[in-house]
């Protein structure tokens, strides 16, 4: 999980002739706001999920009134960043749409009116955790300057935010195959429920057990860099088996335009001509407004006061989808291993581990005996998440530190007398009994019941119990 952050630096007329008319006037003061929509760069987006990675709206900027006769300057901007939280892995390659909206503040009936001033779109590569990337995009006569970055939310780390960090379970080491979590050296990496061994840097998963590779990587665990040297075409996704880039589809293959839109190729991408009632880069936005109550499960509807402007549903924890229609039951995937209890806290999953197991998903079987010493010659025995000591004779307690009274349990049968001895205990048997614990009666004919007494021991002699 993490956050994509967008900082708008300026929005104003681009260089060159044909400067645009100011969007605001003395008669019609207005203010700007921005909408960003993110999609994973290589995904086949369904029409019902227009912004599969997320979307955000900025605050409204300061009110602006055009000075008569002055050219359109850079327009005053809203404060702060646009933040798009993402729940899963950061995909590395993403598509963005940034829309500049004008809110007119005149005396029109029914409150302010919104209209779309400019829309820019692009596709970029970006590693989470990296520095701010700067960009300039032009839309008609307008120019938008902005910076963006993706950062992971703790406990996630890494270029795809797929590695988790957790406090160390032992002071000196992380579990098998897990490294310290730079820069949090006192924490350890922990895997998600992706396929075991999936590269934390170059792989991620959307379904438990799978290992999907970020662009430029291949192999079952995304540990093999894609090599283009032996390939004919540099375009397209990598083939799992060869690690080659194989020819990919053209921009209009499979028609990326939703809702009956028609696609035409442009030199760098494609363009959709949308039917009435739909708009957006892929005709993915319909003329539904917030007045229609499109957000389910308590989702908050933002924007969309008229059919020409988009709405966004901000979903409460536990719901997702463009209309908050999908319940997220992350515990149904049973992510906690080894019988751990799954807790969905809304903002995060937690596993409560059984004794003897650790890790964000209880995936590590603790070495119960590691660093545990049993005193006085005792040996450590692992079991069920707790160590226990098998103590040498004469010692007891959890760590064999206590002197045991071997006679306390009255081990000598049939009235035998017990004596503590450096190597254990000794039973002095009553007449008519023999054995280490005086357990065998002596027969009248002088023969003993099995087992036979060792040679040289007469019935009645004290016998040491070793």
């Amino acid at each position: 999980a993490g956050v994509f952050e967008l900082q708008i630096h300026s929005f104003g007329p681009g260089p060159g002739p044909g400067a645009p008319r100011s969007p605001c006037s003395a008669r019609l003061p207005c203010r700007l706001f921005f909408r960003v929509c993110l999609k994973p760069g290589l995904s086949e987006e369904a029409a019902e999920s227009p912004c599969a990675l997320g979307a955000a709206l900025s605050a409204r900027g300061p009110v602006y009134t055009e000075q008569p006769g002055a050219p359109a300057p850079d327009l005053p901007l809203p404060d702060g960043l646009l933040q798009v939280p993402f729940r899963d892995a950061w995909p590395g390659t993403f598509s963005f749409i940034i829309e500049t909206w004008r809110e007119e503040l005149g005396d029109q009936i029914g409150g302010p009116a919104w209209s779309l001033l400019a829309r820019v779109a692009g596709r970029r590569r970006l590693a989470a955790g990296g520095p701010w990337a700067r960009d300039i995009q032009r839309a008609g006569a307008w120019e938008l300057r902005f910076s963006y970055r993706a950062r992971c939310e703790p406990p996630a780390v890494g270029t795809a935010c797929t590695r988790l960090c957790r406090p160390r379970s032992a002071p000196s080491r992380c579990g098998p195959g897990l490294r310290p979590c730079a820069p949090l050296e006192d924490e350890c990496e922990a895997p998600l429920v992706c396929r075991a061994g999936c590269s934390p840097e170059h792989g991620f998963c959307e379904q438990p057990g799978e290992c999907r590779c970020l662009e430029g990587w291949t192999g079952p665990l995304c540990t093999v860099p894609v090599s283009t040297s032996s390939c004919l075409s540099p375009r397209g996704p990598s083939s799992a088996t060869t690690g080659c880039l194989v020819p990919g589809p053209g921009p209009c293959d499979g028609n990326p335009c939703a809702n009956g839109g028609s696609c035409s190729e442009t030199p760098r991408s494609f363009e959709c001509t949308c039917p009435r009632g739909f708009y957006g880069l892929r005709c993915e936005v319909s003329g539904v407004t917030c007045a229609d109550g499109p957000c389910f499960n308590g989702g908050l509807c933002v924007g969309g006061a008229d059919p020409d402007s988009a709405y966004i549903c901000h979903c409460p924890p536990g719901f997702q989808g463009s209309n908050c229609e999908k319940r997220v039951d992350r515990c149904s995937l049973q992510p906690c291993r080894n019988g751990g209890l799954c807790l969905d806290l809304g903002h995060a999953l937690r596993c409560r581990c059984r004794a003897g197991f650790a890790g964000p998903r209880c995936e590590h079987d603790l070495d119960d005996c590691a660093g545990r010493a049993c005193a006085n010659g005792g040996t450590c025995v692992e079991g069920g998440g707790a160590h226990r000591c098998s103590c040498a004779l004469g010692f007891g307690g959890r760590d064999c530190r206590e002197r045991a009274d071997p006679c306390a349990a009255r081990p000598c049968a049939h009235g035998g007398r017990c004596y503590a001895h450096f190597s254990g205990l000794v039973c002095a048997c009553a007449p008519g009994y023999m054995g280490a614990r005086c357990e065998f009666p002596v027969h009248p004919d002088g023969a003993s019941a099995l087992p036979a007494a060792p040679p040289g021991l007469r019935p009645g002699d004290p016998q040491r119990y070793l």
């Epitope: 098998p176 195959g177 429920v193 396929r195 075991a196 061994g197 379904q207 438990p208 057990g209 799978e210 192999g219 079952p220 665990l221 540990t223 093999v224 799992a240 088996t241 690690g243 995937l333 049973q334 291993r337 995936e363």
Partner: antibody, heavy 118, light 107 residues
């Protein structure tokens, strides 16, 4: 305790097909790849392919790509491996194995002997 | 395909001996190597993953090491139960490939 139980031995004629089943118990079936490995008599191990039950995604060894099909029945937690156009050199013990919580084939079925003979 | 070449093919040793089996990959496989033990008529059993990590329940006398193209499996003190065939396997690239096996027999 994780168990993979395979179907019984089969005798097939050259050109026929065989479908071996592997029933999984005591773990979250959909979350772990099932691998198929075969071993000809007196020979080593040869990987045939894998399937992730939760998604149905398969990866096949190029050597078997045109003849092997792996499928899954989630209702019974069973994976199937079908090999067609059998030849005598396909006589082998066929194993299913589970890619476990660590990076290796952690649990194995008992094996299914497939004999191809005219 | 990546070739995994094991040596020796057969190894004779006695109970209590320390034995080492090596496995060479035809190209870099990082640490994506596992080791398995197989007894006649039985399915293989997992021993080592990620080149050097013991699978749960595997006795501590088994250890693995190596990275890149050279890997070793060491049994520090042979027990009667250890006489079997051992296979290395790479899972860095498709198709997964196994070594041809090393048969460990009683001297």
């Amino acid at each position: 305790q994780v168990q993979l139980v395979q179907s019984g031995a089969e005798v097939k004629k050259p050109g026929a097909s065989v479908k071996v089943s592997c029933k999984a118990t005591d773990y979250i079936f959909s979350n772990y790849y099932i691998e198929w490995v075969r071993q000809a008599p007196g020979q080593g191990l040869e990987w045939m392919g894998e399937i992730l039950p939760g998604t149905g995604n398969t990866v096949y060894n190029e050597k078997f790509k045109d003849r092997v099909t792996m499928t899954v029945d989630t209702s019974t937690s069973t994976v199937y491996m079908e090999l067609s156009s059998l030849r005598s050199e396909d006589t082998a013990v066929y194993y299913c194995a589970r890619w476990g919580d660590y990076a290796l084939f952690a649990n194995w079925g008992q094996g299914t002997l497939v004999t191809v003979s005219s | 395909d990546i070739q995994m070449t094991q040596s020796p093919s057969t190894l004779s040793a006695s109970v209590g001996d320390r034995v080492t089996i090596t496995c060479k990959a035809s190209q870099n496989v990082g640490t994506n190597v596992a080791w398995y033990q197989q007894k006649p008529g039985k399915a293989p059993k997992a021993l080592i993953y990620s080149a050097s990590y013991r699978y749960s329940g595997v006795p501590s006398r088994f250890s693995g090491s190596g990275s890149g193209t050279e890997f070793t499996l060491t049994i520090s003190s042979l027990q009667p139960d250890d006489f079997a065939t051992y296979y290395c396997q790479q899972y860095n690239s498709y198709p997964f490939t196994f070594g041809q096996g090393t048969k460990l027999e009683i001297k």
